[in-house]
C-alpha cells in the first residue's frame, strides 16, 4: 500500500450518501479528533 498526505482543507462524510452530502466538502475536521485535543467531551460539539 502507498502512503499519501491527506488533504487538510476540507472533508466530506463517507457514509452520508450523495443526496445528503450534495457533493459538498465541509470545512470540518476529519471524523476523529486526537485525544490530545480538548479534554471536555462537550467541547467536541463545536465540530458541526
Amino acid at each position: 500500500m502507498e502512503d499519501f498526505n491527506m488533504e487538510s482543507d476540507s472533508f466530506e462524510d463517507f457514509w452520508k450518501g450523495e443526496d445528503l452530502s450534495n457533493y459538498s466538502y465541509s470545512s470540518t475536521l476529519p471524523p476523529f479528533l486526537l485525544d490530545a485535543a480538548p479534554c471536555e467531551p462537550e467541547s467536541l460539539e463545536i465540530n458541526k
Epitope: D13, F14, W15, E18, L29, P31, F32, D35, K48
Partner: antibody, heavy 120, light 116 residues
Framework: QVQLVQSGAEVKKPGSSVKVSCKAS????????ISWVRQAPGQGPEWMGW????????NYAQKFQGRVTMTRDTSISTAYMELSRLRPDDTAVYYC?????????????WGQGTLVTVSS | QAVLTQPSSLSASPGASVSLTCTLR?????????IYWYQQKPGSPPQFLLR?????????GSGVPSRFSGSRDASANAGILLISGLRSEDEADYYC?????????FGGGTQLTVLG
C-alpha cells in the same frame, strides 16, 4: 492511528436483543457518521443504518426500522447498535465503520467485527 | 432483480489485468451514481478501495495502490473495477456498493482467484 474496537462475540436466543459497542481507540468520535454493516456467513455486506455521533441523529435502513437502535456516548467515544427480536437469520458478523473523503482520497475505518450467533 | 449484480467468480494469472463488473438494474443509470468498491479477505472487514462516478469525480482509498482504478461502461450500465498487474495478495472477494433510495446497497460480490 485511530481504530474502531468492537465488543466481543455474543450468543443469543431467538426473541432476545443484542447490543454491540464500537469504541474509537486512540481518538474521539466526531461529527461524521458511524455506519453499522452486517455480513451473514457466505453473504455480502448489508447496511443497517448510521448515527451521527455529534448530533445523535440516525438513519436506519427500512428493513431494520423498529428493530434497531443506534446510540452513542461521546464521553467514552463509543457508539452502540442494539438489535431486538432476534431471529436465527440475524446470525452475522456486525461491523461499525466510519470515514471521510477529501477531493482526491477517501479514508475509511472499520471495526474488527462482532460475531452474533442467534440459536435456540 | 437485484439492484447491483456482480459475477460470482473470476480467475486470472499473476501480472494480468482484470475487470470486475457491477451491473446496475435496468432503470438505474450508472452515470448518476458513485460506485464504491471494496476488497474483503477471509476473517477481515471489507476494505474500501475507491469510488468512481466519472474521471472528474473519483477518489482513491487511502493507501490503495494506483493499480486499482475505476471506470464505467455506459452501454452495459455497469461500473468497473480494473486491477492491473495482478498479484497473489489480490485474491479476495470484491463488492460494489451505491447509495440508492436513501440506503447503501451492496452487490453480491465477486470471488477473485489468482491462479498459480
Amino acid at each position: 492511528q485511530v481504530q474502531l474496537v468492537q465488543s466481543g462475540a455474543e450468543v443469543k436466543k431467538p426473541g432476545s436483543s443484542v447490543k454491540v459497542s464500537c469504541k474509537a481507540s486512540g481518538g474521539t468520535l466526531s461529527s461524521y457518521a458511524i455506519s453499522w454493516v452486517r455480513q451473514a456467513p457466505g453473504q455480502g455486506p448489508e447496511w443497517m443504518g448510521w448515527i451521527n455521533p455529534n448530533s445523535g441523529g440516525t438513519n436506519y435502513a427500512q428493513k431494520f426500522q423498529g428493530r434497531v437502535t443506534m446510540t452513542r456516548d461521546t464521553s467514552i467515544s463509543t457508539a452502540y447498535m442494539e438489535l431486538s427480536r432476534l431471529r436465527p437469520d440475524d446470525t452475522a458478523v456486525y461491523y461499525c465503520a466510519s470515514g471521510y473523503c477529501g477531493r482526491a482520497r477517501c479514508t475509511s475505518f472499520w471495526g474488527q467485527g462482532t460475531l452474533v450467533t442467534v440459536s435456540s | 432483480q437485484a439492484v447491483l449484480t456482480q459475477p460470482s467468480s473470476l480467475s486470472a494469472s499473476p501480472g494480468a489485468s482484470v475487470s470486475l463488473t457491477c451491473t446496475l438494474r435496468s432503470g438505474i443509470n450508472v452515470g448518476a451514481y458513485r460506485i464504491y468498491w471494496y476488497q474483503q479477505k477471509p476473517g477481515s472487514p471489507p476494505q474500501f478501495l475507491l469510488r468512481y462516478k466519472s474521471d472528474s469525480d473519483k477518489q482513491q482509498g487511502s493507501g490503495v495502490p494506483s493499480r486499482f482504478s475505476g471506470s464505467r461502461d455506459a452501454s452495459a450500465n455497469a461500473g468497473i473495477l480494473l486491477i492491473s498487474g495482478l498479484r497473489s495478495e489480490d485474491e479476495a472477494d470484491y463488492y460494489c456498493a451505491i447509495w440508492h433510495s436513501s440506503a447503501w446497497v451492496f452487490g453480491g460480490g465477486t470471488q477473485l482467484t489468482v491462479l498459480g
